[in-house]
């Protein structure tokens, strides 16, 4: 079963402190988008138990294998079904937790009921707040059964489900007719696909005999162990406060697993942690009881004492669940509960036993799932134990399952079942992916989907030139990193294949399908240099360059010119597609810009070394704005403008342009040229009387410059309507003399 646990914190004084945590003990669980495993999902399932909408719950990920749900604002947010999904592929598993309101009218005596196919299930709802009305039972949200309130037995409403079948599984609820559904008692019924003690497609296989309340999985025959127990048959107790398939997880908080409900993959369901019981898992086990929900009784013999977490603690000389076995009876020692081998390997399996009389080689045997008995090929006898070694024939997939080591002496017998997992070495389903290529190297992503079993321990890349009969070159790489194949030949096709391995002897899988990857052509090695450049306009630049003279043909397809505008952080690239070209005209540049210029030879997609850079300043597109523009009305149709020349001119002004517009007018402005650039005054004539005008102006060199400030002025008096403004200019001094 998948190592997935959903913990609910049941200290319910304040719903805001309530949280659910999903913990995965799976290798690579929840890593997300990579090929090795989808993420853990934890959510409220509103399909069956609908609760009024509230603020969204907060999901927090703690590393790759843990996710926590918080943000419950009121008690009704907690009521209902929560689920956690984890594991990858066919092992994807959903763990379900059902939360009941402690203040509900009806409360379940037991929330999770796991029963076998054909059994009778009895769900019991205890009356917490009585109502004299019908009780409605539902199954997965749909009406199922009715009881009259008189049908309560000893303060409980019972729903008997005879001869249950797997489709009967689901969420059941008992609700008083007048009450809110949130006041219901919610149950979870899990019906195993087989009768008691059986598993497999036709229920033909025998379960291993799960101990300590473990439940046999009807699909794979594994024991799903209660929280706090481990081993193939759940025979071993974890240390207090620990859980997970290998006891690798620790309960949070100082009070250990108190107040926590643990939900595990079906067919286990949910329970308190080992040593705790009660609806909120806050009560310690009564003396003589132990385990999850305190469901187990110690019944220790021969002076054993009961520990509420682990069961009987035996005195020296005794062992067994109830301390019922004398140490003189033979005993299998330290047998691993689970072993893993790769398909078609021939492993050696050791089985050690002690006892009095001392076990010898012939008294220890190994039994396969199909009933075949293997005898040991050799035995190592030590003072305190005998270790028998078994050479296993070549493994096939059918060898997966429960094997048994058995020791028999005149003092008695002992056997220990253990799980053997036969794993299929991984085989890539796709070819590796080319990421980048150069003339002498290829960068390859070896991460591919695969058939067979993980985890992937090593990835081998095999490569050789296409159509070659030479030996393959091999490189061993990290599964999660890209690989660079070096020292290759330029412009050459290579056949590349992936081989995956999993841990253990014989873990190498078959090679994956090949793919063709071609190296790039050779890099151009010549470095051009810039001979010169000249400005052909505010946005045009002529550039020339040359190449060193070398013997042999020129390795190159053309040139790339790069202009870097550092002010704007922009790069302009110009492709010259002839390798014979030594000059280029660059147009559409930004006037007044400082550029850094260089040139490179290119071949295929590869660039050679860049020339030493040159720095070029293009002239600005136009001069700065005229200064101190001033307007003065002279009559009812004339206004004089005066100004000062722009500062820091890049060249001689060719003309000025004046813009005239009626203030608040909707029409287009009028532009008037002042063709004598040395002047600093002009008269605008033909204006309308008593009219307010707006004026601004700019100078032109090779292009128009910036606008000056805008000035306002009104014409005088009530003259006749003019035909339109015209201009007369002269030197400022002369204008003033007038």
């Amino acid at each position: 079963a998948v190592d997935l646990t959903l913990l609910a914190n049941l200290r319910l004084t304040d719903p805001q402190r309530f949280f659910l945590t999903c913990v995965s003990g799976e290798a690579g669980a929840g890593r997300g988008s990579d090929a090795w495993g989808p993420p853990l999902l934890l959510e409220k399932d509103d399909r069956i138990v609908r609760t009024p909408p509230g603020p969204p719950l907060r999901l927090a990920r703690n590393g790759s294998h843990q996710v926590t749900l918080r943000g419950f604002s009121k008690p009704s947010d907690l009521v209902g079904v929560f689920s956690c999904v984890g594991g990858a592929g066919a092992r994807r598993t959903r763990v379900i937790y059902v939360h009941n309101s402690p203040g509900a009218h009806l409360l379940p005596d037991k929330v999770t009921h796991t029963v076998n196919k054909g059994d009778t299930a009895v769900l019991s709802a205890r009356v917490h707040k009585e109502k004299q009305t019908d009780v409605i039972w539902k199954s997965n949200g749909s009406y199922f059964y009715t009881l009259d309130w008189h049908e309560a037995q000893d303060g409980r409403f019972l729903l008997q489900l005879p001869n249950v079948q797997p489709p009967s599984s689901g969420i059941y609820s008992a609700t008083y007719l007048e009450a809110s559904p949130l006041g219901s008692a919610f149950f979870r019924l899990i019906v195993r696909g087989c009768g008691a003690g059986r598993w497999g497609p036709g229920c033909t296989k025998e379960c291993p005999g799960c101990l300590h309340g473990g439940v046999c999985h009807d699909h794979d025959g594994e024991c799903v162990c209660p929280p706090g127990f481990t081993g193939t048959r759940c025979e071993q107790a974890c240390r207090e406060g620990r859980f997970g398939q290998s006891c690798q997880e620790q309960c949070p908080g100082i009070s250990g697993c108190r107040g926590l409900t643990f939900c595990l993959p079906d067919p286990y369901g949910c329970s308190c942690g080992s040593g705790w019981r009660g609806s909120q898992c806050q009560e310690a086990c009564a003396p003589g009881h132990f385990g999850a929900d305190c469901r187990l009784q110690c019944q220790c013999q021969n002076g054993g004492t009961c520990d509420r977490f682990s069961g009987c603690v035996c005195p020296s000389g005794w062992h067994g669940v109830h301390c019922e076995k004398s140490d003189r009876i033979p005993q299998i020692l330290n047998m691993a509960s689970e072993l893993e081998f790769n398909l078609e390997t021939m492993p050696r399996i050791n089985c050690a036993a002690a006892g009095n009389p001392f076990p010898v080689r012939g008294s220890i045997e190994l039994r396969k799932p199909d009933g075949t008995v293997l005898l040991s090929t050799k035995a190592i006898v030590e003072p305190e134990k005998t270790t028998a070694e078994f050479e296993v024939p070549r493994l096939v997939l059918a060898d997966s399952g429960f094997w048994e080591c058995r020791v028999s002496t005149s003092g008695g017998q002992d056997s220990r079942r253990f799980k053997v997992n036969v794993k299929v070495p991984p085989v890539p389903l796709a070819a590796p992916r080319l990421l980048t290529k150069q003339s002498r190297q290829l960068v390859v992503s070896p991460l591919v989907s695969f058939s067979g079993d993980g985890p992937i321990s090593t990835v081998r890349l095999h490569y050789r030139p296409q159509d070659s009969t030479m030996d393959w070159s091999t490189i061993v790489v990290d599964p999660s990193e890209n690989v660079t194949l070096m020292n290759l030949r330029p412009k050459t096709g290579y056949s590349v294949r992936v081989q995956l391995s999993r841990p253990g002897e014989g873990g190498e899988g078959a090679w994956g399908p090949p793919t063709l990857m071609t190296t790039d052509c050779p890099e151009p090695l010549l470095q051009p240099w810039l001979e010169g450049w000249h400005v052909e306009g505010t946005d045009r630049l002529r550039v020339s360059w040359s190449l060193p003279l070398v013997p042999g043909p020129l390795v190159g397809d053309g040139f790339l010119l790069r202009l870097w505008d550092g002010t704007r952080g922009q790069e302009r690239r110009e492709n010259v597609s002839s390798p014979q070209a030594r000059t280029a005209l660059l147009t559409g540049l930004t006037p007044g810009t400082h550029y850094q210029l260089d040139v490179q030879l290119y071949h295929c997609t590869l660039l050679g070394p860049a020339s030493p850079p040159a720095h070029v300043l293009l002239p600005p597109s136009g001069p700065p704005a005229p200064r101190h523009l001033h307007a003065q009305a002279l009559s009812d149709s004339e206004i004089q403008l005066t100004w000062k020349h722009p500062e820091a001119l890049p060249g001689p002004i060719s003309k000025y342009v004046v813009e005239v517009q009626v203030a608040g007018g909707a029409g287009d402005p009028l532009w008037i040229d002042v063709d004598r650039p040395e002047e600093t005054s002009t008269i605008i004539r033909g204006l309308n009387a008593s009219t307010r005008y707006l004026f601004r102006m700019r100078a032109s060199i090779q292009g128009l410059g910036d606008w000056s400030n805008t000035v306002e002025e009104s014409t005088l008096g009530n003259g006749l309507q003019a035909e339109g403004p015209v201009q007369e200019s002269r030197a400022a001094e002369e204008g003033l003399d007038q």
């Epitope: 609908r50 609760t51 009024p52 004299q132 009305t133 019908d134 409605i136 949200g141 009406y143 199922f144 059964y145 009715t146 009881l147 009259d148 008189h150 049908e151 609700t175 007719l177 007048e178 009450a179 809110s180 559904p181 949130l182």
Partner: antibody
Framework: EVQLLESGGGLVQPGGSLRLSCAAS????????MMWVRQAPGKGLEWVSG????????LYADSVKGRFTISRDNSKNTLYLQMNSLRAEDTAVYYC????????????????????WGQGTLVTVSS | DIQMTQSPGTLSLSPGERATLSCRAS???????VAWYQQKPGQAPRLLIY???TRATGIPDRFSGSGSGTDFTLTISRLEPEDFAVYFC??????????FGQGTRLEIK
């Protein structure tokens, strides 16, 4: 398809007895509360009796209490009404009906209703 | 015992008109316990509305129910010829378990 089919009606003298049956099909009969409702000629509907799924709880209208007995055989999917000491005022069409329980809204309480009815059987008590 | 009283006894309207049928409980009741039924001559009643306001499966949306406390209403927004029938309100009670109103006859004007 859910079907309820009443039978056993007929003409009977005052003081006489009659047993009505209601054969159910198309649903899991043993899980539903069932009712008998009657309608005198030209009059309204009157509830007569009800029985819960287990058969352990039965309910009667005051007008028939002590004279009528409701029962069910879940193995035969059949509802019964044993009518003794019949009176002229018991003359009516007798319907059997199934009680269903609905979620009236996503979050509100459950709402009962008589969702399927038989076609009725006429009982005439007359001398 | 609680009683359910329907009004009017008879309602004469034309197709296309709006019908409003009333049902009053003799004391306040839980709304989820109120249902409405339609009965045509020679036929068994048919469940229209449960929980005072939720239409049963297959019931056209011209039928709607409302009300709370003691007063409940069945509204047919636009009468179709097949809607002319007798309508009963019903309460799911304690004792007696099922209480019907005396019915409202809806006839063509």
């Amino acid at each position: 398809e859910v079907q309820l089919l009443e039978s056993g009606g007929g003409l009977v003298q005052p003081g006489g007895s009659l047993r009505l049956s209601c054969a159910a099909s198309g649903f899991t009969f043993s899980r539903y509360t069932m009712m008998w409702v009657r309608q005198a000629p030209g009059k309204g509907l009157e509830w007569v009796s009800g029985i819960y799924p287990s058969g352990g709880v039965t309910l009667y209208a005051d007008s028939v209490k002590g004279r009528f007995t409701i029962s069910r055989d879940n193995s035969k999917n059949t509802l019964y009404l044993q009518m003794n000491s019949l009176r002229a005022e018991d003359t009516a069409v007798y319907y059997c009906a199934r009680v269903n329980y609905y979620d009236s809204s996503g979050y509100g309480p459950i709402a009962p209703g008589l969702d399927y009815w038989g076609q009725g059987t006429l009982v005439t008590v007359s001398s | 015992d609680i009683q359910m009283t329907q009004s009017p006894g008879t309602l004469s309207l034309s197709p296309g008109e709006r019908a409003t049928l009333s049902c009053r409980a003799s004391r306040s009741v839980i709304i989820s316990y109120v249902a409405w039924y339609q009965q045509k001559p020679g036929q068994a009643p048919r469940l229209l509305i449960y929980g005072a306001s939720t239409r049963a499966t297959g019931i056209p949306d011209r039928f709607s129910g409302s009300g709370s406390g003691t007063d409940f209403t069945l509204t047919i927004s636009r009468l179709e010829p097949e809607d002319f029938a007798v309508y009963f309100c019903q309460l799911y009670g304690r004792s007696p378990r099922i209480i019907f109103g005396q019915g409202t006859r809806l006839e063509i004007k």
